[in-house]
């Protein structure tokens, strides 16, 4: 005859305050006759949770049908949870006994214990923005959690990052844990687009881990590029010249021109475009009088971004004898 | 100590009705099936009728003979269990005796006394 | 329904010998591993009681000197050694299907 063995399979069950928790338990055999009842804690002084035979238990039900034939599934649910619920239970065979019952057999116990979900991750990125190929660091927390082990795992653009640093306070015994981390992160120049994310896996997340995000476009400064250029082509007395901004980002940008030195207040075409990777390009084009021009004109091209310090690029203008002859012989 | 207690026997005509009781102390009466079991010389022992719990939604089974003229009935708030005997028979007359079921499968480990039942003109 | 036969209908045995009951079912009273057969004892005047449950396991407060044994159609009741107290009338009943059926009984007299 096969001895009769008392299954608990879940060592720890994290309940949620006001929830139903459920405690598995069950038997190999039918024999000896006689009730299982439900106890937390061990000793004189434990607590009886349920018995199937004797009294009433309104928070207690049972998952399957005891009257069943051949039952062996000894589970209960209990509902309502509340903090002072939690414990180590046992489920316990009893030999049917005269005039009392005698215990026959326990289960190893499942500790019962209130989990916590932890708050969704929070992730903040540097205070000012930074250029491409150098590090900033982003910080996540998470709060409220409970027990103490969790996960935290960062994500660039899906990649997973390696060069982070993780803390869960407090150290000792607490009702809730916090977590704090701070990832480094290394900037390309494409990072506008890019993101990073916070992953937080804990056991009251039922495998379904919390994420926070943050926004490289918020961390990262691309700086432009400058280009000034003369168009070959004239307009009656007037010669093209072209600024291109290319390759910025954020899109704030300030560009003025300069006439061998004194800038000019006069309005100028532009256009604005973005690019596929979130960076912006500017042209600019400023038409110079070349009627009664000299041949040392310098045009100046100077660009302001995002509060920085003020980047230029020059031109010499290239007026030919023809080009003035051309222009004098122009009516007004 | 479990304690089960019939009464309401006694003669009756053919075509009768009858009511008897049983009492139970000593035990959650809720959590127990409860039976009725007669014995006469002429059959022996025959199980007559069980009633089970309010999860069961107190389901009930008979006996063929006995089916459509008995009635088996329970009150958890009184720890009784009664059994309704209508259009009494000559062959209904015998020892009844109320019955708990320990283990949901037939298992008679307590008996009352039992009370008798007789049908005769 | 389950027909129970017990046999012999009445025995002598003497005092300190082995008394064997037997009680054969019309069907199989046997599932999943387990025998629906028990086994009473009841003296002029009083109830039926439980001696034996699920074929082969003893009720508690039962003396050890009554077992019971057997599977599927065939159960037998033994009692060594037999005491004068055990003078009495015993009946199976089987617990396999509804209605649950007893045996005819079997009168022990103590030589």
């Known amino acids: 005859e096969e001895e009769l063995q008392m299954i608990q399979p879940e060592k720890l069950l994290l309940v949620t305050v006001g929830k139903t928790a459920t405690l598995h338990c069950t038997v190999t055999s039918l024999l000896p006759v006689g009730p299982v009842l439900w106890f937390r804690g061990v000793g004189p002084g434990r607590e009886l949770i349920y018995n199937q035979k004797e009294g009433h238990f309104p928070r207690v039900t049972t998952v399957s049908d005891l009257t069943k034939r051949n039952n062996m599934d000894f589970s209960i649910r209990i509902s309502s949870i509340t903090p002072a619920d939690v414990g180590t239970y046992y489920c316990v065979k009893f030999r049917k006994g005269s005039p009392e019952n005698v215990e026959f057999k326990s289960g190893p116990g499942t500790e019962m214990a209130l989990g916590a979900k932890p708050s969704a991750p929070v992730v903040l990125g540097p205070a000012a923005r930074t250029t491409p190929e150098h590090t900033v660091s982003f910080t996540c927390e998470s709060h409220g959690f409970s027990p103490r082990d969790i996960t935290l795992k960062w994500f660039k653009n899906g990649n997973e990052l390696s060069d982070f640093q993780t803390n869960v306070d407090p150290t000792g015994q607490s009702v809730a844990y916090s977590i704090r981390s701070t990832a480094r992160v290394v900037l390309d120049p494409w990072d506008v687009r890019s993101q990073v994310i916070c992953e937080v896996a804990h056991v009251t997340l039922q495998g379904d881990p919390l994420r926070g995000t943050a926004n490289l476009s918020e961390a990262i400064r691309v700086p432009p590029t400058l280009e000034v250029t003369q168009q070959p082509m004239r307009v009656g007395n007037q010669v093209n010249v072209t600024c291109q901004v290319r390759k910025f980002y954020p899109q704030s940008l300030q560009l003025t021109w300069s006439e061998n030195g004194n800038v000019c207040q006069r309005e100028t075409a532009s256009t604005l475009t973005e690019n596929k990777d979130g960076t912006y390009n500017w042209t600019s084009w400023f038409l110079v009088n070349i009627s009664d021009q000299r041949d040392d004109v310098v045009l100046t091209c100077q660009v302001k971004h995002d509060g920085q310090l003020a980047v230029s690029k020059r031109l010499a203008l290239e007026v030919t004898v023809h080009q003035k002859d051309q222009s004098s012989d122009a009516t007004p | 100590e479990v304690k089960l207690e019939e009464s309401g026997g006694g003669l009756m005509q053919p075509g009768g009705s009858m009511k008897l009781s049983c009492v139970a102390s000593g035990f959650t009466f809720s959590n127990y099936w409860m039976n009725w079991v007669r014995q006469s010389p002429e059959k022996g022992l025959e199980w007559v009728a069980e009633?089970?719990?309010?999860?069961?939604?107190?389901?009930?089974h008979y006996a063929e003979s006995v089916k459509g003229r008995f009635t088996i009935s329970r009150d958890d708030s009184k720890s009784s269990v009664y059994l309704q005997m209508n259009n009494l028979r000559a062959e209904d007359t015998g020892i009844y005796y109320c019955?708990?079921?320990?283990?949901?499968?037939?298992?008679?480990?307590?008996w009352g006394q039992g009370t008798t039942l007789t049908v005769s003109s | 329904d389950i027909v129970l036969t017990q046999s012999p209908a009445s025995l002598a045995v003497s005092l300190g010998q082995r008394a064997t009951i037997s009680c054969r079912a019309s069907k199989s009273v046997s599932t999943s591993g387990y025998n629906y057969m028990y086994w009473y004892q009841q003296k002029p005047g009083q109830p039926p009681k439980l001696l034996i449950y699920l074929a082969s396991n003893l009720e508690s407060g039962v003396p050890a000197r009554f077992s019971g044994s057997g599977s599927g159609t065939d159960f037998t009741l033994n009692i060594h050694p037999v005491e004068e107290e055990d003078a009495a009338t015993y009946y199976c009943q089987h617990s396999g299907e509804l209605p649950y059926t007893f045996g005819g009984g079997t009168k022990l007299e103590i030589k």
């Open positions: 019955i708990r079921d320990y283990d949901y499968d037939a298992y008679f480990d307590y």
């Open positions: 009633i089970r719990l309010k999860s069961n939604n107190y389901a009930t």
